[in-house]
């Protein structure tokens, strides 16, 4: 069975400053990723950063960086200020689009006893929804 | 809840121009569909694909406002446009606005997929 694990690290030289790594554990060929804070996209959250394996890549403040890491992970950096930077509680969620297997999505926040710029290594974070 | 609210509809002559405008708002959170689409509805008729465009710019136009109307997306990625130039006749009908994503990313043929709709603006060319 497919499934995603999500990493959220805060950068020890900026407090303001996150960054959040996805990856997909399966078999298919990933055809879209979405990354979001607050909640899945187009339910409670707002999509940070869409990306495309072909297509390119789309970004909305306060993501500063997104990229592709491998064919099936990915990295965001966030850093903002006020109102539209994240805080220590936000949830980040990554979707996962892949042929044949669907869509998968998973999200975190960081761990509540971390220090900036320490985290848990990657695990699979538990699956919310398999369309 | 996702709400979608379209805004540029009137009266205009044969030849004329129109700017439709389409905001996707939510509350408590930012939608950026995937994709945002017009239809449009002529009295009498079914409805009908006008325009699509993704998130990533990719436009799609029924053969009908080749050439004629323009899809565009604010950097924002929740506000569509459809600037109508040399509008004719049979462009007479009400226009509406649709949100929804996809597995690629892409608009869906025809509209499929599309889950949020907006109440619709009229537009007739008349002179």
């Known amino acids: 069975t497919p499934e995603v694990w999500v990493q959220v690290r805060m950068e020890a030289t900026e407090l303001s400053s996150f960054t959040i790594r996805c990856g997909f554990l399966g078999s298919g060929s990933i055809s879209l990723v979405t990354v979001s804070w607050g909640g899945p996209n187009g339910a409670g959250g707002t999509t940070l950063a869409v990306l495309h394996p072909e297509r390119g890549i789309r970004q909305w403040a306060p993501a500063r960086q997104a990229r592709w890491e491998t064919q099936s992970s990915i990295s965001l950096i966030l850093e903002g200020s006020g109102a539209s930077s994240p805080c220590a509680n936000t949830t980040f969620c990554c979707k996962f689009a892949s042929f044949p297997e669907g869509s998968w999505e998973a999200c975190g926040s960081l761990p509540p006893s971390s220090d900036p710029g320490l985290s848990a290594p990657p695990t699979p974070a538990p699956i919310l929804r398999a369309d | 809840e996702v709400q979608l609210v379209e805004s540029g509809g009137g009266l205009v002559q044969p030849g004329g121009s129109l700017r439709l405008s389409c905001v996707a708002s939510?509350?408590?959170?930012?939608?950026?569909?995937?994709?945002m689409a017009w239809f449009r509805q002529a009295p009498g008729k079914e409805r009908e694909a006008v325009a699509g465009?993704?998130?990533?710019?990719?436009?799609t136009y029924a053969d009908s406002v080749k050439g004629r109307f323009t899809a565009s997306r604010d950097n924002a990625g929740f506000s569509l446009y459809l600037q109508m130039n040399s509008l004719r006749a049979e462009d007479t009908a009400v226009y509406y606005c649709?949100?929804?994503?996809?597995?690629?990313?892409?608009?869906?043929?025809?509209?499929?997929?599309?889950?949020?709709w907006g109440q619709g603006t009229m537009v007739t060319v008349s002179s």
């Open positions: 649709a949100a929804g994503d996809s597995p690629d990313g892409r608009c869906p043929p025809l509209g499929q997929g599309l889950n949020y």
């Open positions: 939510a509350s408590g959170f930012t939608y950026r569909p995937y994709c």
């Open positions: 465009i993704d998130i990533f710019g990719g436009t």
